[in-house]
Interface confidence: low
Amino acid sequence: KFSKQSWGLENEALIVRCPRQGKPSYTVDWYYSQTNKSIPTQERNRVFASGQLLKFLPAAVADSGIYTCIVRSPTFNRTGYANVTIYKKQSDCNVPDYLMYSTVSGSEKNSKIYCPTIDLYNWTAPLEWFKNCQALQGSRYRAHKSFLVIDNVMTEDAGDYTCKFIHNENGANYSVTATRSFTVKDEQGFSLFPVIGAPAQNEIKEVEIGKNANLTCSACFGKGTQFLAAVLWQLNGTKITDFGEPRIQQEEGQNQSFSNGLACLDMVLRIADVKEEDLLLQYDCLALNLHGLRRHTVRLSRKNPSKECF
């Protein structure tokens, strides 16, 4: 399933993007998966669909569930699933793990903390920032656009940072908060031309027709936090999202940091129900950053079913 987890707090705005992308001319229909009931597009509804976005204004605990989005083009449909969980507001200061967005790392050189998911909302600066529930005060903290900059970062700056902003929809304002952990690294990082650890160049992977197969593209980009780096798969020189084969999907794997400090990313290509025609495709693992792009090509070959000896 091409699904994405989303979460929010009751009485706050939550906007969810369909995990499947499409051109602007494509229509996107949203359904509540349990009942297959269509989500209305009229903005007077508290929960409504707006193209690739599903809006909860505001969200309620009862909205929790799986929502289906179908991106419709003239030639194919793509289905995605948004797994939405709305939690009750916490009475104390602790932010539970299930409400936390991905941890970010900073160093003396680079200490930006981005406000998670903010790009989905119609918000205006400035953002409010809190650390461990305390409003941030002092000249070391600068709220700049959608991120917080901390000057002269120290190890004591590690902790949970919450951004709070207002989403405006047709003149009505809704509050949104999002929290992520910030860790401080001592070492000076660097980036280098991407190094692909897997797959090997021109690797042949054996697969069984009718079975599922996974290919992992794994690359390293340097030491320390890498702000501009990505790995992705292509099929016959085409992005997976544009290839239009729903059996073949890519999924972001682990962001790995090794004991030697190397920062690496994985992208897993999942092929469901392998078919003969899949053996004819060229699978490219791409790793890229500001230094450039490296490509390793993989082809599939048929694995002969093992003969059992009796």
């Epitope: 051109k23 602007p24 193209g51 981005y114 656009k145 959608s146 501009l228 990505a230 992705l232």
Partner: nanobody, 122 residues
Amino acid sequence: ESGGGSVQAGGSLRVSCAASGYTYSSYCMGWFRQAPGKEREGVASIDSRGSTTYADSLKGRFTISKDNAKNTLYLQMNNLKPEDTAKYYCAAGDGYGLEHICIPHYYAMNYWGEGTQVTVSS
């Protein structure tokens, strides 16, 4: 795209790209160029926060910007050289579907303009 044309070496041009609301709200927008017989190459990109990234080869001659009120993306090109002759394309996308990744790579873009020709003569 608009604003392309012919200019003498050392001159300046500003190309612009008017985008629809859907495309303009994409996380990542950028300029690319393609010279005859060459591959399309990234020139510059700008994300929804206004952070910019440029191809190393440009050495500060080009500036990317956007006007949110007008849904328009710009590329200011100064001290133009004959090797800048190319068709310039505006593009928009979701980065890689990963958070906060916007660099001028073809793979980051989902939507493309028709292109505007820039010719620099010596």
